[in-house]
Interface confidence: low
Amino acid sequence: SEVEYRAEVGQNAYLPCFYTPAAPGNLVPVCWGKGACPVFECGNVVLRTDERDVNYWTSRYWLNGDFRKGDVSLTIENVTLADSGIYCCRIQIPGIMNDEKFNLKLVIKPAKVTPAPTRQRDFTAAFPRMLTTRGHGPAETQTLGSLPDINLTQISTLANELRDSRLANDLRDSGATIRIG
């Protein structure tokens, strides 16, 4: 069963998902989609990474953490009730049926106090830079094709109710993760 995360209307929602690259800079493709994880890929893709970078993303959906180190947690900016539902984080490990799939349930609650209107085109109002707290990973990346054997040492997800990426990073850095497998 999926883990549940909560946020209020107008806030940024945080959906954690992590993996540890087998070697620094050797990234594994990841997709985020709206809806439970299907057999393959992600449905209704909102963001996708490849072996090097984020190669597809849509407005309001961000990887605020250090995805070059495997923090592929999704931030959804300025959520509305329509953002409620199941989200799929799929870590696309090479090989047949090797993917790790995480279904995360996002529950959006009405705001306790009506938030001030967000200036949608003003980045700092909608999604402050202050949320970033971690450095980026290695400068050089290699394609997975050069790696005959991918060993992901850790694929983990935070089970805490976390809305703020700074808090998420602080907790993760202090070991507040759940090991999968």
């Epitope: 970078d53 309001r60 961000w62 085109r121 980045f123 700092t124 830079r129 450095g135 980026h136």
Partner: antibody
């Protein structure tokens, strides 16, 4: 090969306008933020504005807010800086630079050669 | 705004010298600090990102470190092509801010 090429600089009178262009090649600007950084003659570097084209997000230094507008045309893989109500203190070499990854906040891994803007009567 | 106080503003050194440039942030910026090298008439070049990561293609004689809000760029053995101006930059919060620069000159 990643390349950024600025154009549009020149001499303009105080109160005038200029539009700078930053043509990118070797990468898709949708996947990166584009920043404008300026350097007055003999001075240090000053961040001016940036944009994340995919989300349309923009941010400005207080010194240029309400006078400068940053934009991007992803079909042309080009970013722009529209500069209005120019002042003498805007005189500088203007560089466009690419954010190392797609997020707004980042170090700048590629820079253009710069274009000189001179505001003088 | 976060101030990045860079020191020294200039220094004279010889080829082979170990050179250290420091930058102090006026408040916490975590590891969100980059270092750039700029030569006259040229655009800056990224040397170090995230306080201590060496950017691709940059010689290993360059290194960066962090201690709280103090950041250091070290050139272990100065080479002739290293004579330039160096800038630190924080990108932790908006607006991103640069240090005033350190000019490394030949002694």
């Amino acid at each position: 090969e990643v390349q950024l090429v600025e154009s549009g600089g020149g001499l303009v009178q105080p109160g005038g306008s200029l539009r700078l262009s930053c043509a990118a090649s070797g990468f898709n600007i949708r996947n990166h933020a584009i920043h404008w950084v300026r350097q007055a003659p003999g001075k240090g570097l000053e961040w001016v504005a940036d944009i994340a084209p995919a989300g349309g997000y923009t941010d400005y230094a207080d010194s240029v807010k309400d006078r400068f507008t940053i934009s991007a045309d992803t079909s042309k893989n080009t970013a722009y800086l529209q500069m209005n109500s120019l002042r003498a203190e805007d005189t500088a070499v203007y560089y466009c630079a690419r954010g190392y990854v797609y997020r707004m906040w980042d170090s700048y891994d590629y820079w253009g050669q710069g274009t000189l803007v001179t505001v003088s009567s | 705004d976060i101030q990045m106080t860079q020191s020294p503003s200039s220094l004279s050194a010889s080829v082979g010298d170990r050179v250290t440039i420091t930058c102090r942030a006026s408040q916490d910026v975590n590891t969100a600090v980059a270092w750039y090298q700029q030569k006259p008439g040229k655009a800056p070049k990224l040397l170090i990102y995230s306080a201590s990561f060496l950017y691709s293609g940059v010689p290993s004689r360059f290194s960066g470190s962090r201690s709280g809000t103090d950041f250091t760029l070290t050139i272990s053995s100065l080479q002739p092509e290293d004579f330039a101006t160096y800038y630190c930059q924080q990108h932790y919060t908006t607006p991103p801010t640069f240090g005033q620069g350190t000019k490394v000159e030949i002694k």
